[in-house]
Amino acid sequence: CKAMHVAQPAVVLASSRGIASFVCEYASPGKATEVRVTVLRQADSQVTEVCAATYMMGNELTFLDDSICTGTSSGNQVNLTIQGLRAMDTGLYICKVELMYPPPYYLGIGNGTQIYVIDPEPCPDSDF
């Protein structure tokens, strides 16, 4: 098993609809054909798994049906989108990439993307 460099943006601001997107790029030492991508959230020294997908190179990322994540891959880049975020979900989102095949197994962990989520202000009552 070997280590691998993973790059991701330092900061992302979620949209008013609670959607945040960022790119996770890994420095693959070879031509991986099976890759597993996991998004972890670190807050208050606790690490929890947000979502994960295993994909064959050239195919779409497939997250579980009830996942809050979607994504696409292009070469050594994965474009990740997390939806349904609220202010309480603000935190450090870490991209983890595992090259499962061919051997050897590689593991790469990014430094994390700080995602800021601001709940939208409720619309004021308006007179018609």
């Epitope: 098993c1 054909t33 597993r36 499962m100 593991l107 962990i109």
Partner: nanobody, 119 residues
């Protein structure tokens, strides 16, 4: 807690067949590479075969065409079908699982099962 429990070892004649099985407990089966290593007396441990969550397989040259690895997601087991066994296949066969848990790389091992090929 993750546990790997092997079964199916034993004594077999040259040219015979055996099937090893490894049952995995804990939430690793769908996320980890799983496979088999073996160690013969006085020799280094060597990879026999492994299989990824996506079903990609990898074999040692010495077992290609004779051994077949498979995984059963419904039972959380990994099997190793060993055909055309030879005396130099005699070893302790250990199941392993390799992957990561949150931010840490992990490798888990079973206790091992003895396979002896002898007439």
């Amino acid at each position: 807690e993750v546990q790997l429990v092997e079964s199916g070892g034993g004594l077999v004649q040259p040219g015979g067949s055996l099937r090893l099985s490894c049952a995995a407990s804990g939430n690793i089966f769908s996320r980890y590479i799983m496979g088999w290593y073996r160690q013969a007396p006085g020799k280094e441990r060597e990879l026999v075969a492994d299989i990824t969550p996506g079903g990609n397989t990898n074999y040692a040259n010495s077992v290609k065409g004779r051994f077949t690895i498979s995984r059963d997601g419904a039972k959380n087991t990994v099997g190793l079908q060993m055909n055309s066994l030879r005396p130099d296949d005699t070893a302790v066969y250990s199941c392993y699982a390799r992957g990561s848990d949150k931010l840490l790389m992990r490798t888990y091992w079973g206790q091992g099962t003895q396979v002896t090929v002898s007439s």
